[in-house]
């Protein structure tokens, strides 16, 4: 609807009207993905009792999910910006096969699972522009990823449900650690 000259809209405008800086874009993108993961976890936890299960170790044996370790330079003690950035990008690239696995694991949140996957691709792209030492980043082998995907999809129903839960939980933790580290950069 037309607004007469000089008359303000009743909505509160978002205070930030500058184009986002690289760091702001990355921060907002991670928070957007984390919200998506929360929505997916909600469906997973409603559908099964995996979120309260104590049998996680059984399924975890099949998985090699990326985790932050002291040596990665992302924690406050021993923080190293370049090492940490390489770890974040490498970890996200390693998570991609697990996000692909999630694509057929949701009924009501199918589009949300795709949004998390695609938003992660965009996040990697944002981070690539920030990294200087791109040579240190190893990309996962497509053949290895394909056979891992086949193996995960061949698991029984219980293990598949547990795998879905573990991927979401680990990815959430990895992104939260990444967010904390990136805010120090």
């Amino acid at each position: 609807a037309p607004v007469p000259p000089g008359e303000d809209s009743k909505d509160v405008a978002a205070p930030h009207r500058q184009p986002l800086t690289s760091s702001e874009r990355i921060d907002k993108q991670i928070r957007y993905i984390l919200d998506g993961i929360s929505a997916l976890r909600k469906e997973t936890c409603n559908k099964s009792n995996m979120c309260e299960s104590s049998k996680e170790a059984l399924a975890e044996n099949n998985l090699n999910l990326p985790k932050m370790a002291e040596k990665d330079g992302c924690f406050q003690s021993g923080f190293n910006e370049e090492t940490c950035l390489v770890k974040i990008i490498t970890g996200l690239l390693e998570f991609e096969v697990y996000l692909e696995y999630l694509q057929n694991r949701f009924e009501s949140s199918e589009e949300q699972a795709r949004a998390v996957q695609m938003s992660t691709k965009v996040l990697i792209q944002f981070l690539q522009k920030k990294a200087k030492n791109l040579d240190a980043i190893t990309t996962p082998d497509p053949t290895t990823n394909a056979s891992l995907l086949t193996k995960l999809q061949a698991q029984n129903q219980w293990l598949q449900d547990m795998t879905t839960h573990l991927i979401l939980r680990s990815f959430k933790e990895f992104l939260q650690s990444s967010l904390r580290a990136l805010r120090q950069m």
């Epitope: 930030h16 874009r25 907002k28 957007y32 998506g36 690239l93 589009e111 792209q125």
Partner: antibody, heavy 120, light 111 residues
Amino acid sequence: QVQLQQPGAELVKPGASVKMSCKASGYTFTNYIIHWIKQTPGQGLEWIGAIYPGNGDTSYSQKFKDKATLTADRSSSTAYMQLSSLTSEDSAVYYCARGDAGYSAWFAYWGQGTLVTVSA
Amino acid sequence: NIVLTQSPASLAVSLGQRATISCSASESVDSYGNNFMHWYQQRPGQPPKLLIYLASKLESGVPARFSGSGSRTEFTLTIDPVEAEDAATYYCQQNNEDPLTFGAGTKLELK
């Protein structure tokens, strides 16, 4: 199914402002980012900016940062774009679109567009 | 800004033949094997419709006669075979860098 409803047209006077709406249905409004795109015969398709209704965060193109203000009303699942200090250059079709890859995206779902005509 | 140059500006193709549209980016839109280039079809009075995303992935519900290829700076949309309903304007779009930008469009007409 996912739908983004926009009013068909707005006629506004030079110097005035216009606030157009984009009502979302068929999905959880707070889960996806809404982008706005301008289309003119001369300049083609231009990205204006985006808003995440989940928390109100926005991102603007440098070109439109002083022209457009993006807001969202979660209670009515509606995104809004206000354009200020209108001139004939702002006459265009404005689309809202859902981005499924966050703040930088491609668009599987589009509104039908609002034709804004700036004329005395 | 990344500039996308589409060619040709227009082309006329006979029914059943192949149509090829090119999009050249002023800088690479590649990131770890993902090419952030997408293709849309727009008919008069309609919003654009997503056909191809990430250079080569077919959007759900889009006929298989549409395909996308290319990497880094050079991309192609192919329609084979062309059908009557394909008469429209086709746009490429990149999201490798803000602001997101679109090509100027290629108008496909039927002979």
